[in-house]
């Protein structure tokens, strides 16, 4: 039975040219996290595997950095980065948990981070 829940940074905004941290956190389960996949709509951005470490898709290597933790840092943001991002937690024995984050990249300097939890 899947008892876990994924907490995410929710809907967030950031300035064009800036960077943002995408964070998810799996709680309320003792399941072992074996892998976390990060996707942007229909594109695989990165994978963090418990044994193999990080794999960043080559087409995103210059703008995506692993971490902190199981999170993902997006750099040199453009308005085209606006959209949905998904963290997919592969766990044993529970199975798969998915979290959703919506990022809006703004032209102006009025971008604010709306977050459900603090990013250190």
């Amino acid at each position: 039975m899947m008892t876990g829940t994924i907490e995410t940074t929710g809907n967030i905004s950031a300035e064009k040219g800036g960077s943002i941290i995408l964070q998810c956190h799996l709680s309320s389960t003792t399941a072992q996290v074996t892998q976390v996949n990060w996707e942007q709509q229909d594109q695989l951005l990165a994978i963090c595997n418990a044994d193999l470490g990080w794999h960043i898709s080559p087409s995103f290597k210059d703008r995506v950095a692993p971490g902190p933790g199981l999170g993902l840092t997006l750099q040199s943001l453009t308005v085209n980065d606006t959209g949905e991002y998904f963290c997919i937690y592969h766990t044993y024995p529970d199975g798969t948990y998915t979290g959703r984050i919506f990022l809006e990249v703004l032209e102006s300097s009025v971008a604010e981070h709306g977050a459900r939890f603090q990013i250190p």
């Epitope: 074996t34 996707e39 594109q43 044994d51 794999h55 898709s57 044993y92 024995p93």
Partner: antibody, heavy 118, light 107 residues
């Protein structure tokens, strides 16, 4: 250098059993999911089964479920496929393949031929 | 199960030609799509993974594109060693499934 070497193929009668092995070298075997893929003569590729790093999860194609068992021995760097109740339609070259991140199959063995015939 | 439909099933081309092979999934598979090359009597070889990432050691004339349900493998300038059969494969969910293959023959 990554190497995968299958063995155990051969001629077997319908209803018989066979155990395939895949000896791995050149990488940390226990860190990777492993797969069996087969190819009937003159046909395309068909995924058969896969096993996660620590044997925690095993997956099978419907066509072999209940007849084939995938297993691994990380201390011996070896992948196995126990095939029971074999049928003529199981005749194929069987390949083992490494599956990093459970997303692609980057290294394949040379294959071992299984022929099921009376 | 996710069905993978490849087209064409075969094609004839000349050295230097630009060749395009398409693969369609029966449901969205994000970018969990890989391409393999197989020559007679040999094991398949990974060319492209995650729809568009070139596997290490594979010539840059091979490229992949697409996401969701429609994907393309392109060989920009066909070389003599490229005459082979090409397969797409989805890894979005088990069972993993392959396309039926595209045989690239010499015209």
């Amino acid at each position: 250098e990554v190497q995968l070497l299958e063995s155990g193929g051969g001629l077997v009668q319908p209803g018989g059993s066979l155990r395939l092995s895949c000896a791995a070298s050149g990488f940390t075997f226990s860190s990777y999911s492993m797969h069996w893929v087969r190819q009937a003569p003159g046909k395309g590729l068909e995924w058969v089964a896969s096993i996660k790093y620590s044997s925690s999860n095993k997956y099978y194609a419907d066509s072999v479920k209940g007849r084939f068992t995938i297993s691994r021995d990380n201390s011996k760097n070896t992948l196995y496929l126990q095939m029971n109740s074999l049928r003529a339609e199981d005749t194929a070259v069987y390949y083992c393949a490494r599956g990093p991140y459970d997303v692609w199959l980057d290294y394949w063995g040379q294959g071992t031929l299984v022929t099921v015939s009376s | 199960d996710i069905q993978m439909t490849q087209s064409p099933s075969s094609l004839s081309a000349s050295v230097g030609d630009r060749v395009t092979i398409t693969c369609r999934a029966s449901q969205s598979i994000s970018s969990y799509l890989n391409w393999y090359q197989q020559k007679p009597g040999k094991a398949p070889k990974l060319l492209i993974y995650a729809a568009s990432s070139l596997q290490s050691g594979v010539p840059s004339r091979f490229s992949g594109s697409g996401s969701g349900t429609d994907f393309t493998l392109t060989i920009s300038s066909l070389q003599p060693e490229d005459f082979a059969t090409y397969y797409c494969q989805q890894s979005y969910s088990t069972p993993l499934t392959f396309g039926g293959g595209t045989k690239v023959e010499i015209k």
